[in-house]
């Protein structure tokens, strides 16, 4: 990758972030009725998320996400969930490259929609600080 | 059977270069991320900086800007570039196999860099 | 950056002894944790993986458990070969981050 390769790679890093930061905000929102209810999905985890590639596991879970999303009210987002995931999947797509043999690995656990977030989030953050 | 072999290691006074590298054997290694790490006299393991697949590259505050990771998967070798050394970048440099899910699962027997005048 | 904070950072014991290092995450590192195995002038073998899990040819002396924030690695009968230095390190972020080691000596 070259510097502005890598420049544009952080902007959608950071976009990410964004995105995936809004949703968490929309969920816990206190006037958000259904988040009993959305913490009943459980969500799949990645083994290990430190490197863009791992982004195969963001991509795989984001249409259970979209589902999940699709309870809440949509007064708690600036856009419709299908638009929003939709966003998320072109970045994710970008980002993790087109290597399409790259599988992903879960962990043993399953996690609430808010630890997905938070995960997914933490990584994003951990890579536009190590990303040089 | 897997190996790491660094070599390039020396001394070197402070604000100049070196370069290290790592011959890698034994598994697919455009496959794999690779990593240095280093450990101090005496002290513990520092991670120093990484290389996935697809050549994106990663490191701590503590080197960005004068450190460069790279890789030649034609020749299955890693590369690093240590610009404007200190003293206290002393230490054995180990290149390590990052496991696609796992840990640092193989490393190399390591090369020392002394920075002194 | 995530700290892990291992103890004690040093040990005495026999052979025959069960050993437990620990090592805490600053923050939930699942179970993102492996272990290592340095001898004097030698570099660091990889022991644990995903906090529990033996890499292949590790006796099964060694175990290791926790998930989140804390982590242990035992060893249930120690033999000569077995004193060394022990690192945990966190895998779960980048930057990776090690506990600062604990030197297991003979008694």
């Known amino acids: 990758p070259t510097s502005s390769s890598t420049k544009k790679t952080q902007l959608q890093l950071e976009h990410l972030l964004l995105d995936l930061q809004m949703i968490l905000n929309g969920i816990n929102n206190y006037k958000n009725p259904k988040l009993t209810r959305m913490l009943t999905f459980k969500f799949y985890m990645p083994k290990k998320a430190t490197e863009l590639k791992h982004l195969q596991c963001l991509e795989e879970e984001l249409k259970p996400l979209e589902e999940v999303l699709n309870l809440a009210q949509s007064k708690n987002f600036h856009l419709r969930p299908r638009d929003l995931i939709s966003n998320i999947n072109v970045i994710v797509l970008e980002l993790k490259g087109s290597e399409t043999t790259f599988m992903c690995e879960y962990a043993d656990e399953t996690a609430t929609i808010v630890e997905f977030l938070n995960r997914w989030i933490t990584f994003s953050q951990s890579i536009i600080s190590t990303l040089t | 059977e897997v190996q790491l072999v660094e070599s390039g290691g020396g001394l070197v006074q402070p604000g100049g270069s070196l370069r290290l590298s790592c011959a890698a054997s034994?598994?697919?290694?455009?496959?794999?991320?690779l990593a240095w790490v280093r450990q101090a006299p005496g002290k513990g393991l520092e991670w120093v900086a990484a290389i996935d697949s697809s050549s994106y590259t990663y490191s701590p505050d503590t080197v960005r800007g004068r450190f460069t990771i790279s890789r030649d998967n034609a020749k299955n070798s890693l590369y690093l570039q240590m610009n404007s050394l200190r003293a206290e970048d002393t230490a054995v440099y180990y290149c390590?196999?990052?496991?696609?899910?796992?840990?640092?699962?193989?490393w190399g027997q390591g090369t020392t860099v002394t920075v002194s005048s | 950056d995530i700290q892990m904070t291992q103890s004690p950072s040093s040990l005495s014991a026999s052979v025959g002894d069960r050993v437990t290092i620990t090592c805490k995450a600053s923050?939930?590192?699942?179970?993102?944790v492996g272990w290592y195995q340095q001898k004097p002038g030698q570099s660091p073998k990889a022991l644990i993986y995903?906090?529990?899990f033996r890499y292949s040819g590790v006796p099964s002396r060694f175990s290791g458990s926790g998930s989140g924030t804390d982590f242990t690695l035992t060893i249930s009968s120690l033999q000569p070969e077995d004193f060394a230095t022990y690192y945990c390190?966190?895998?779960?972020?980048?930057?990776?981050?090690f506990g600062g080691g604990t030197k297991l000596e003979i008694k």
């Open positions: 390590a196999r990052d496991s696609n899910w796992d840990a640092l699962d193989y």
């Open positions: 995903s906090a529990s």
């Open positions: 034994g598994f697919t290694f455009s496959s794999y991320t």
């Open positions: 923050q939930n590192v699942g179970t993102n």
């Open positions: 390190q966190q895998y779960y972020t980048y930057p990776y981050t």
